[in-house]
């Protein structure tokens, strides 16, 4: 079948005092072979520090998956989450609130 | 082969600015973040910033946040540093470096000598 | 802001010797953010090790690194001709990211 870049999205919510997970979902791409990770000035978190989904089909013929990682709040600005998929790669950061950001990654 | 040519020397009066320009070769430009560093004559190293050149996030060493600028042309895959307010301790080699997979700076510029002298 | 301290500034050596350089942090970093760094005169800083223990690509075993929390080392087990330089420790923990002031490697 053909590429499809997946649809990338950042969301955050409290998780103790004074820190907050950040997920970071791809959903609706194929083929299945992707690179999902948590940057912090753009090195990537050691993998103790993150966890990551299954790669799993998502019922269209696609795929989806997600990471996620605990950050300390006020740091958000140092930290993104990096995708590279079939060749292409797109960097997001954390939204600031509670809003959403999606970013769809054009071939 | 990864590279980071950076353009060369300058001599500047103080109070004028200079940009220093570096471009990298041999990955993907937007794909980690430039980073920027100085070195005074006979001194140590002292980081000025970086940029993320895909979603043009900057974040500077707040003792640099006032004078430096820092900027990139995704059309041309290059970063630049603008100082401005230049005065004699700002006489150093600056560096651009990139952002590694597990470090922070793992390719380096050649560097690029900012002479700043009435 | 994180203060690095190295020691000894300067290190007198002859060849084949072992080269222990010490980094000291004013807070407690985590051992993935705390690397290496060579220096040679009139050329730009090179990554020696990365996340305190990892050798960067091309650098020789006999370099390595150690440590955790506020103390670090690395060592040069048998210095070769090449190694004389001058090494800086950096931390990539909190912002602003720091180095220390370099130990000076010179030949005895």
């Known amino acids: 079948g053909s590429t499809v870049p997946p649809m990338v999205n950042v969301t955050r919510s409290e998780a103790s005092e004074g820190n907050i997970t950040v997920t970071c979902r791809a959903s609706g791409f194929y083929p299945w072979n992707i690179t999902l990770s948590w940057r912090q000035d753009g090195v990537s978190l050691s993998h103790d520090t993150q966890q990551w989904g299954d790669v799993l089909p998502d019922g269209n013929g696609t795929y989806q998956t997600w990471v996620a990682t605990r950050i300390c709040q006020g740091e958000e600005q140092r930290f993104t989450c990096y995708m590279e998929h079939s060749g292409n790669h797109s960097t997001h950061p954390v939204p600031s609130g509670n809003s959403h950001h999606h970013h769809h990654h054009h071939h | 082969e990864i590279q980071l040519v950076q353009s060369g020397a300058e001599v500047k009066k103080p109070g004028a600015s200079v940009k220093v320009s570096c471009k990298p070769s041999?990955?993907?430009?937007?794909?980690?973040?430039i980073y920027w560093v100085r070195q005074a004559p006979g001194q140590g190293l002292e980081w000025i910033g970086y940029i993320d050149p895909y979603i043009g996030r900057i974040i500077y060493n707040q003792q640099f946040k006032d004078r430096a600028t820092l900027t990139v042309d995704k059309s041309t895959s290059t970063a630049y540093l603008e100082l401005s307010s230049l005065r004699s301790e700002d006489t150093a080699v600056y560096y651009c470096?990139?952002?590694?997979?597990?470090?922070?700076?793992?390719?380096w510029g050649q560097g690029t000598l900012v002479t700043v002298s009435s | 802001e994180i203060v690095l301290t190295q020691s000894p500034a300067t290190l007198s050596l002859s060849p084949g010797e072992r080269a222990t350089l010490s980094c000291s942090a004013s807070s407690s970093i985590s051992s993935n953010y705390l690397h290496w760094y060579q220096q040679k005169p009139g050329q730009a800083p090179r990554l020696l090790i990365y996340?305190?223990?990892n050798l960067a690509s091309g650098i020789p075993a006999r370099f390595s690194g150690s440590g955790s929390g506020t103390d670090f080392t690395l060592t040069i087990s048998s210095l070769e001709p090449e190694d004389f330089a001058v090494y800086y420790c950096?931390?990539?923990?909190?912002?602003?990211?720091?180095f220390g002031q370099g130990t000076k490697v010179e030949i005895k």
């Open positions: 996340r305190t223990s």
């Open positions: 041999g990955y993907a430009f937007t794909s980690n973040n």
């Open positions: 470096s990139r952002s590694g997979e597990r470090s922070n700076f793992d390719y």
């Open positions: 950096q931390q990539g923990g909190s912002l602003p990211l720091t």
